[in-house]
Amino acid sequence: WPPPGTGDIIVQAPTQVPGFLGDSVTLPCYLQVPGMEETHVSQLTWSRHGESGSMAVFHQTQGPNYSEPKRLEFVAARLGTELRDASLRMFGLRVEDEGNYTCLFVTFPQGSRSVDIWLRVLAKPQNTAEVQKVQLTGKPVPVARCVSTGGRPPAHITWHSDLGGMPNTSQAPGFLSGTVTVTSLWILVPSSQVDGKSVTCKVEHESFEKPQLLTVNLTVYYPPEVSISGYDNNWYLSQNEATLTCDARSNPEPTGYNWSTTMGPLPPFAVAQGAQLLIRPVDKPINTTFICNVTNALGARQAELTVQVKEGPPSEPSGMSSN
C-alpha cells in the first residue's frame, strides 16, 4: 500500500527491560524514520500480551489515556508535537507487571508498526552469611549458612572451599509476594583442622553488577589435642636446666594445664609453670614419663613423654635441651 521510499520506518526498542519491584521503569520505544522518508503518526498504543484492550494510548487530538492513570505516563509524547517517542513510564512495579508488552505506532502512509518488549520485574536480594558453630559430631553437619533474602528471580548461591564438603540449598517465599529467599548450608564432617578456616559464599543475581562474595570463618569446638615438645633425646647429667612445653590446640582455649608423672606427683627437679615444665639439673640419671593434662570446656586430654637424663660426654656447656 505505501509508496516506495528510500527505506522503511522502524520501531526501535530493547527486547528486554529490567525494573525493580516497587520502583518505576521506562519502557523505551521510538520510531526511527530514514532521512528521505515521510511519516505521520496519529496514535501511540501500548498493550499487554494476554490482556484485552490497550493499557495506554496517545491520540493525536485526544492526548493520553491510560487503563491505570496513576501508574502509567507517556514520557515524551505531547499534543501538538510529532509523535515519534512512545516511551512509557510505569510506576510502583508489581510482580504481576512482568510480561510481554507491545508498543505500536499508527502511521501514514506506512500503516501500523509495532515492537514487543519483555518487562522483567526484579527484586534485589539482601545477602548474609554466618557461621554455624559445631562440635565434633563424626557426621556431616552444616558449618556455614548463606541466605539471600527477597530476590526475584531467586539468587544463585555457590560455595568455594578447600576443605571439602557439599552444599544444601533450599528456597522459600520471600516477605514480598513473588520474591524468593534462598538458603544454602555448607555441610561437612567437622574436625579440628577445619576450625578457623574459611569458606566463601558466592551470590549471583541479575541485579548485581558482579557476584557478592561473603566469607565465613568456621568454628569447630573440640577438646584439647595435646603434645609435649622440648625434648630431643640428648639430655645429660650436669647440664643446664631445660624446658618441656605442653602444646595444646583446642576450641575453646584451654582453661588449665596439669603436669604429673606416671608415678604420681612431679619430682622435686620438675617445676610446673602453666604450659611449661622446668627441668632443673640433676646429678644422677633419671628415666621419667611426664604427663601433661589439658582441660577446656569440652573436656580434658593428655599427652605423655618419657625423658631420660643420661651419663655421657657433655663437653659443651649447653642445657639438657636445646631450648
Partner: antibody
Framework: EVQLVQSGSELKKPGASVKISCKTS????????MHWVRQPHGKGLEWIGG????????SYNQRFKGRVTLTVDKSTSTAYMELSSLRSEDTAVYYC?????????WGQGTLVTVSS | DIVMTQSPSAMSASVGDRVTITCKAS??????VAWYQQKPGQPPKALIY???YRYSGVPDRFTGSGSGTDFTLTISSLQAEDLAEYFC?????????FGQGTKLEIK
C-alpha cells in the same frame, strides 16, 4: 471549530470523471492526513484512500485500480478527490474525513450519481 | 483484506435497555478499532478509538472493549437519541475496512 465542507452533488455519465473538494477550517491543514470514504445508499462504508498535505504522500485502496487521484491545495486548505472511469456502482455519498488513526471529523458528504 | 463482521445487522430495543453490538475481525487487529455512530442523513460521528477509549464529549453510556479479533460496543442505558446506525472500523492495516453496520431502532 473544526469544519470540513464538501462541494455539492454531482450527476455523471458512465465513463466520466468527477472531482470533489473538501475545504477545511478550524485546524492546521498540514498537520493531519485527509482520507476519503464512500457509502452507497443504504450500505456500508468503504475506504478509498488518504493523502497527507505536507509532502503529498498518498495511500490508496487497490480496489480502485488507479481510478482515484487525491490532491491538496495547501494555500486554501482544501483536499480533492478525483474518480475517473465512473460506472453505475460508483453511485454513493463520498465523504472526506480527517484521519487521526480513526476518523475524528467528517465532511457532510457529496452525493455522486452515475447514470446514463 | 481484513473483513469486519458486525452483528446483529439490525435490532430494536427500548429506552433504558442495555444494548451490545459485536464486531469480529478476520485477523488480529490488536486494539486498532474505532466505532462510529451515523444518524440518518448525517456523516458518521466518532465514538470510540483504540477499541476502548471514548472521544471527549461522547456520553459515558457508550463503552468499547476487546482486542485481537473480538470487539464490543455497549450502550449501558439506551436513550431515544441513540437511534442510529453503528459501524466498527479497523485501522491496523491497509485497506482500512468497516463493518457492514448495525441499525438500531427504538421500540
Amino acid at each position: 471549530e473544526v469544519q470540513l465542507v464538501q462541494s455539492g452533488s454531482e450527476l455523471k455519465k458512465p465513463g466520466a470523471s468527477v472531482k470533489i473538494s473538501c475545504k477545511t477550517s478550524g485546524y492546521t491543514f498540514t498537520e493531519y492526513t485527509m482520507h476519503w470514504v464512500r457509502q452507497p445508499h443504504g450500505k456500508g462504508l468503504e475506504w478509498i484512500g488518504g493523502i497527507h498535505p505536507n509532502q503529498g504522500e498518498t495511500s490508496y485502496n487497490q480496489r480502485f485500480k488507479g481510478r482515484v487521484t487525491l490532491t491538496v491545495d495547501k494555500s486554501t486548505s482544501t483536499a480533492y478527490m478525483e474518480l475517473s472511469s465512473l460506472r453505475s456502482e460508483d453511485t454513493a455519498v463520498y465523504y472526506c474525513a480527517r484521519w487521526t488513526g480513526d476518523f475524528d471529523y467528517w465532511g457532510q458528504g457529496t452525493l455522486v450519481t452515475v447514470s446514463s | 483484506d481484513i473483513v469486519m463482521t458486525q452483528s446483529p445487522s439490525a435490532m430494536s430495543a427500548s429506552v433504558g435497555d442495555r444494548v451490545t453490538i459485536t464486531c469480529k475481525a478476520s485477523q488480529n487487529v490488536g486494539t486498532n478499532v474505532a466505532w462510529y455512530q451515523q444518524k440518518p442523513g448525517q456523516p458518521p460521528k466518532a465514538l470510540i478509538y483504540s477499541a476502548s477509549y471514548r472521544y471527549s464529549g461522547v456520553p459515558d453510556r457508550f463503552t468499547g472493549s476487546g482486542s485481537g479479533t473480538d470487539f464490543t460496543l455497549t450502550i449501558s442505558s439506551l436513550q431515544a437519541e441513540d437511534l442510529a446506525e453503528y459501524f466498527c472500523q479497523q485501522y491496523e492495516s491497509y485497506p482500512y475496512t468497516f463493518g457492514q453496520g448495525t441499525k438500531l431502532e427504538i421500540k
